[in-house]
Interface confidence: low
């Protein structure tokens, strides 16, 4: 004969546990129903009556099957440097993440507690490591043969243009200036040039090109295979 299905509340067999979505009530010494997400236990079970559940009030939630007497309070409204990526509902907490151009300086279990602006790299510096949701931008000086003339969180060091005749040599914060004849090579519009690494993890760096030579743009990325986003550091 098939085993008889027990309805909550029921006394568990010695040594056995309650079923999924049930909990053992120490006072009643019975297996009782949990409340579903979005609800909480309004009245705990007894030997003869099951748990009575009620919906969470506004601005409170429960995310899991539970038997808590009160729902959890949703987190405070998102601050001005954050955006609400998940609203407060009866079944989930509000989640705040940093708005574009900011990163999470202090995270919490879900979302971010404290956002900070991504730093901007000053002229002469380019982004060596782009910012992520949880890490700030890292700037590095432009190596000889490269330059950045902006204060930006998205600009990397770019190679100097190569002139037939140089009017003003380039430096770390300024491109070379050619005489009226056109340069032999200049940056193609929209071309991505990776920054010369100031130091590379676990690798020797090749000799740095002199400013008068075309800089090499082939090197091992300090962060792995994905190309870095363009430069940034905040003052």
């Amino acid at each position: 004969l098939p085993a008889q299905v027990a309805f909550t509340p029921y006394a568990p067999e010695p040594g056995s546990t309650c079923r999924l979505r049930e909990y053992y009530d120490q006072t009643a010494q019975m297996c009782c129903s949990k409340c579903s997400p979005g609800q909480h236990a309004k009245v705990f079970c007894t030997k003869t009556s099951d748990t009575v559940c009620d919906s969470c009030e506004d601005s409170t939630y429960t995310q899991l099957w539970n038997w808590v007497p009160e729902c959890l309070s949703c987190g405070s409204r998102c601050s001005s440097d954050q955006v609400e990526t998940q609203a407060c509902t009866r079944e989930q907490n509000r989640i705040c993440t940093c708005r574009p151009g900011w990163y999470c300086a202090l995270s919490k279990q879900e979302g971010c507690r404290l956002c900070a602006p991504l730093r901007k790299c000053r002229p002469g510096f380019g982004v060596a490591r782009p910012g992520t949701e949880t890490s700030d931008v890292v700037c590095k000086p432009c190596a000889p043969g490269t330059f950045s003339n902006t204060t930006s969180s998205t600009d990397i060091c770019r190679p100097h243009q190569i002139c037939n005749v140089v009017a003003i040599p380039g430096n770390a914060s300024m491109d070379a200036v050619c005489t009226s004849t056109s340069p032999t090579r200049s940056m193609a519009p929209g071309a991505v040039h990776l920054p010369q690494p100031v130091s590379t993890r676990s690798q020797h760096t090749q000799p740095t090109p002199e400013p008068s030579t075309a800089p090499s743009t082939s090197f091992l990325l300090p962060m792995g295979p994905s190309p870095p986003a363009e430069g940034s550091t905040g003052d």
């Epitope: 300086a105 730093r119 400013p211």
Partner: antibody, heavy 119, light 106 residues
Framework: EVQLQESGPGLVQPSQSLSITCTVS????????VHWVRQSPGKGLEWLGL???????DYSAAFISRLSINKDNSKSQVFFKMNSLQADDTAIYYC?????????????WGQGTTVTVSS | EIVLTQSPALMSASPGEKVTMTCSAS?????MYWYQQKPRSSPKPWIY???NLASGVPARFSGSGSGTSYSLTISSMEAEDAATYYC?????????FGAGTKLEIK
């Protein structure tokens, strides 16, 4: 007030490893990198490596095979470990804050911890 | 590795005298940094990005240079300037220091 303080063993046996902790205050390791530099009478100031604010380390090629640097942001501590020490590793070991924001200078230094490698 | 050669290794100057020390790089660098160190003390940042004075550094100090040749100048030597000065670059890995110029007061 920005401060860095190194704590190390003082004396290390040859072929053993050296572990130093740099405890920082007045700033967050999530915003600044930390360098390790040593100074010995024979070799002057010598850069060993650093750990960036994002947690990734850079090592001097001369030490990469026996050096590791990591950190615990929540404890504001940076951990330096060098293996296979020899007598010429005797030096004062410093940690110094890196200005990741663009000036790119070691703007604050610890007081240094003296390490002697001897049996 | 970029080698930085500082000269002179040792120099002395009288109060009020102009002092210049140099740092020569084995290949071109974008910027030079200078640190001051006194006996039994940690190095202190002194000049960054070639010519910028670190916080608290007297205006009598200046830095200049480009490419492979850099210098630190004191317009008028004072007793408190007696120290060892190290140049440093980080254009390529590894970051390197010069061997230092020890400046004494006459």
């Amino acid at each position: 007030e920005v401060q860095l303080q190194e704590s190390g063993p003082g004396l290390v046996q040859p072929s053993q490893s050296l572990s130093i902790t740099c405890t920082v205050s007045g700033f967050s390791l999530t915003s600044y990198g930390v360098h390790w530099v040593r100074q010995s009478p024979g070799k002057g100031l010598e850069w060993l490596g650093l750990i960036w604010s994002d947690g990734s380390p850079d090592y001097s090629a001369a030490f990469i095979s026996r050096l590791s640097i990591n950190k615990d942001n929540s404890k504001s501590q940076v951990f330096f470990k060098m293996n296979s020490l020899q007598a010429d590793d005797t030096a004062i070991y410093y940690c110094a804050r890196n200005d990741d924001g663009g000036d790119y200078v070691m703007d604050y230094w610890g007081q240094g911890t003296t390490v002697t490698v001897s049996s | 590795e970029i080698v930085l050669t500082q000269s002179p290794a040792l120099m002395s100057a009288s109060p009020g005298e102009k002092v210049t020390m140099t740092c020569s790089a084995s290949s071109s660098v974008s910027y030079m940094y200078w640190y001051q160190q006194k006996p039994r003390s940690s190095p202190k940042p002194w000049i960054y990005l070639t010519s910028n004075l670190a916080s608290g550094v007297p205006a009598r100090f200046s830095g200049s240079g480009s490419g492979t040749s850099y210098s630190l100048t004191i317009s008028s030597m004072e007793a408190e300037d007696a120290a060892t000065y190290y140049c440093q670059q980080w254009t390529s890995n590894p970051l390197t220091f010069g061997a230092g110029t020890k400046l004494e007061i006459k």
